[in-house]
């Protein structure tokens, strides 16, 4: 689970997920409250409900080890494994490129950000 | 037609190695998404899935045994092997090889079995 | 692991009796599989991702069910569906199956 993002994000963005977005904002890292600062933190709190989509499915988030491929700028999430295996690798897919969609938007101000400061309405998935 | 036969040492004895064959046809181990599986079945119980092996080479394990288990390949021939290290009579069993459905998760294909017996 | 619990796990029907059997999920699960096996013969495929009929099979059989609770119904018992049948789940690893419901012919 945790592994396999940080490897995928990193592989995508090009950035160190540890230095760069976990955490970020009010949603990029454990746990995410109140609005979503910017599009990089709303890539993580996407991200979330995609967890949290698994969890009612019975599937081991942080466990669960997927396997996949990184060639030429894309993944291929393999299917190979079990159902839980082949979503999880999904959700990371999609955050992957999420955030390296909004790279240009990305403010170092919202590293380490606060979280006693993340308010307002938690958008619902 | 696709077809999967097992081949195995009939009898062994307590912690001997026990190696088995599954050779088929109608299909190639090479492309990609194709993976066979090993089954057993101890006689008059269920169903207890052993091992899968894939196109590339990748290779799953139950848990329950993984420390005991071997799968492996020969593309070239058609054939996928199993080894089971330090047996004991509970591993008497009819072993099967199965092919697994294109894109999905289920056994579209079954060999006959071939019967093992553990004597002490 | 998943511990998919059968029940029945022995039962007979008459000739055109409608049969359910059911495969219970310890934990959640999106799709089921079933097989079919007729003494001394292998396990044969019989419907996969919950519903669908694998090719051959009559059309009295259907399969249903989500979350935990997943079932095979025969609508119209006959002679040649009795046989042992078995539930399989790869949600998460590992693989797994059922213990079996065996459906004699009364």
């Known amino acids: 689970g945790i592994l396999n993002l940080n490897k995928m994000v990193k592989q995508v963005t090009g950035k160190m997920p540890i230095l760069s977005y976990w955490p970020y904002g009010c949603h990029c890292g454990l746990g995410g409250r109140g609005q979503p600062k910017d599009a990089t933190d709303w890539c993580c709190q996407t991200h979330d409900c995609c967890y949290d989509h698994l969890k009612t499915q019975g599937c081991s988030i942080y466990k669960d080890y997927y396997r996949y491929n990184f060639s030429q700028g894309n993944i291929h999430c393999s299917d190979k494994g079990s159902w839980c295996e082949q979503q999880l690798c999904a959700c990371d897919k999609e955050v992957a490129f999420c955030l390296k969609r909004n790279l240009d938007t990305y403010q170092k101000r919202l590293r380490f950000y606060w979280r006693p400061h993340c308010r307002g309405q938690t958008p619902g998935c | 037609q696709v077809t999967l036969k097992e081949s195995g040492p009939g009898i062994l004895q307590s912690s001997q190695t026990l190696s088995l064959t599954c050779s088929f046809s109608g299909f190639s181990l090479s492309t990609s998404g194709m993976a066979v599986s090993w089954i057993r079945q101890p006689s008059g119980k269920g169903l207890e899935w052993l091992a899968h092996?894939?196109?590339?080479?990748?290779?799953r394990y139950n848990p329950s045994l993984k420390s005991r288990l071997t799968i492996s390949k020969d593309t070239s021939r058609n054939q996928v092997f199993l080894k089971i290290t330090s047996v004991d009579t509970t591993d008497t069993a009819t072993y099967y090889c199965?092919?697994?459905?294109?894109?999905?998760?289920?056994?579209?294909?079954w060999g006959t079995g071939t019967t093992v017996t553990v004597s002490s | 692991q998943i511990v998919l619990t059968q029940s029945p796990a022995i039962m007979s029907a008459s000739p055109g009796e409608k049969v359910t059997i059911s495969c219970s999920a310890s934990s959640s699960v999106v799709y089921m599989y079933w097989y079919q096996q007729q003494p001394g013969s292998s396990p044969k495929p019989w419907i996969y991702?919950?519903?669908n009929l694998a090719s051959g099979v009559p059309a009295r059989f259907s399969g249903s069910g989500s979350g935990t609770s997943y079932s095979l119904t025969i609508s119209s018992m006959e002679a040649e569906d009795a046989a042992t049948y078995y539930c399989?789940?790869?949600?998460?690893?590992?693989?797994?199956f059922g213990a079996g419901t065996k459906l004699e012919l009364k």
């Open positions: 199965a092919r697994r459905g294109p894109g999905t998760w289920y056994f579209d294909v």
């Open positions: 991702r919950t519903s």
């Open positions: 399989q789940q790869y949600h998460s690893s590992p693989l797994t």
């Open positions: 092996i894939y196109w590339d080479d990748d290779k």
